[in-house]
């Protein structure tokens, strides 16, 4: 759920106006406090449905609940990509869709949700206990992934409710971006409150700003998502894996990550890996990916409308860097 709060406009301090300064000193902490409390993490939900008509046909729907711009969605099966999973599709808002059999009809449903139909026969077909994972790369939140599978007792035609599955991963872009700002804000807030204790109460003066204040947008986790935090993470079952998959190792990375210092960049790769920690059998987990967006102001590669990461239209090959990123 998105919460919107009206916040008084903050003016630059004017010398000699202790009262006004005091007023602003009081307002700023509350703004920061509101952000600290209400800024919930983004979420990814995954819904897996087996079609009643064809037992080998699945529909996977995934969505991203967050305020950022989606730049790339990766759908995999058999577990998260880079932790034994195999890429089924990648979707970019502008550059289009790429899908690997048995994926069919990957498409955008909205600007923040996608669907994918899987059709297969024999070795390449999915089965009821397959785990499907969706990873959303967005700016500024970073990369977030959740997995889901059909409940064991699912009848064909039924589907698991859309689980805002536990957020599995956040990369450094998100953590250093949003979280960093919030952390700084919270620390600053504590500093201000501490200072405020040792000062006389300031005289309140009317703010000289227009009545129409800017709106500060913050995200609060929904009830559904809070409940989801208690849902155990589905055990990845490898008995129904793509026949063509050898053991996957977390190496490589998408070629659209721009050049970064080696210690700070991990390029996820096409149908390749997104680094992750081992997956526990039960319980949710969060792992931090060693990946940063090339430039903080830029949105990632392909997915939501109007996004691009490389300044060079040739994309991946434009800039060769320390990690082979163009």
């Amino acid at each position: 759920m998105r919460t919107e709060a009206q916040v008084p406009a903050l003016q630059p301090p004017e010398p000699g106006l202790e009262g006004a300064m005091g007023h602003r000193t009081l307002v700023l902490p509350w703004v920061l406090l509101t952000l600290c409390v209400t800024a919930g993490t983004p979420e990814v939900w995954v819904q897996v449905r087996m079609e009643a008509t064809e037992l080998s046909s699945f529909t996977i729907r995934c969505g991203f609940l967050g305020s950022g711009s989606i730049s790339l969605v990766t759908v995999s099966w058999g577990g998260p990509n880079g932790a034994g999973g195999t890429t089924l599709a990648v979707l970019h808002p502008e550059r289009g869709i790429r899908q690997w059999a048995p994926a069919r009809q990957a498409r955008w449903e909205t600007q923040s949700s996608i669907s994918l139909i899987l059709e297969g026969s024999g070795a390449s077909s999915p089965c009821a206990n397959t785990t499907f994972c969706c990873k959303f790369a967005s700016f500024p939140e970073g990369s977030w992934e959740a997995c889901g599978s059909l409940p064991p007792s699912s009848d064909p035609g039924l589907s698991a409710p859309p689980t805002p599955a536990p957020i599995l991963r956040a990369d450094l872009a998100g953590i250093l971006g949003v979280s960093g700002v919030l952390l700084f804000g919270c620390v600053y807030l504590l500093h201000l409150l501490r200072r405020h204790k040792h000062r006389p109460a300031p005289r309140l003066q009317p703010s000289r700003t227009s009545p129409q204040a800017p709106r500060a947008r913050a995200w609060a986790p929904s009830q559904a998502s809070q409940a989801a935090l208690h849902v155990p993470y589905a055990t990845i079952n490898t008995s129904c894996r793509p026949a063509t998959l050898d053991t996957a190792h977390p190496h490589g990375g998408p070629s659209w990550w721009a050049s970064l210092p080696t210690h700070a960049a991990h390029r996820p790769q096409g149908p390749a890996a997104w680094a992750s920690t081992p997956i526990p059998a039960r319980g949710s987990f969060v792992s931090v990916e060693n990946g940063l967006y090339a430039q903080a102001g830029e949105r990632p590669p392909h997915t939501g409308p109007g996004l691009t990461l490389f300044p060079d239209p040739r994309g991946p090959r434009a800039m060769e860097g320390p990690l082979g990123v163009r």
Partner: antibody, heavy 119, light 107 residues
Amino acid sequence: QVQLQQSGAELARPGASVKLSCKASGYTFTNYGISWVKQRTGQGLEWIGEIYPGTINIYYSERFKGKATLTADKSSSTAYMQLTSLTSEDSAVYFCARDDGYYDAMDYWGQGTSVTVSS
Amino acid sequence: DIQMTQSPSSLSASLGQKVILTCRASQDIGSSLNWLQQEPDGTIKRLIYATSSLDSGVPKRFSGSRSGSDYSLTISSLESEDFVVYYCLQYTSSPWTFGGGTKLEIK
């Protein structure tokens, strides 16, 4: 600069196997995939499959499952394709091509390896 | 599988002439289409990627465009080295598929 160097021509007996190689240079091997493509004499191009050495994700065209096996050696930046149970239908030139798995598909190509199956 | 129907299969043209080669996709492939050039010695080179983007080092006389499910490669003024074989490639849905090729011959 990016280069894909393929192994030399092969002459094999029916029923035998051959293993073709594609050595990559000029880029980070694990950041891209290698696709393999078949071209019979005077005919068009046909995709066999691809391997992503960074994750060992492997994909095959249905037509080539059981015929081709793709592997990669990260230490030597080399991709391999083994063709088994060879018949005259497998006589062709086989190309490898680089692919990023996103939107830079088959941007660089090897020079091709000719395979002739004859008794 | 997505079928790519390329036409014409062969084309005779003169130096300096403008030619247009086309590929039709049996399903929606968005902009995920490349044009490749194959020399007589077998060497394959990508000319155009993502429907209309020119690869580096490729002469500006080559251009790509799309109209619905029809994709075109235009050579604005033929030069002697252009008389080779051209293929289109879709890479939106595996198996990736190629057009049957167009052999460009000098008239």
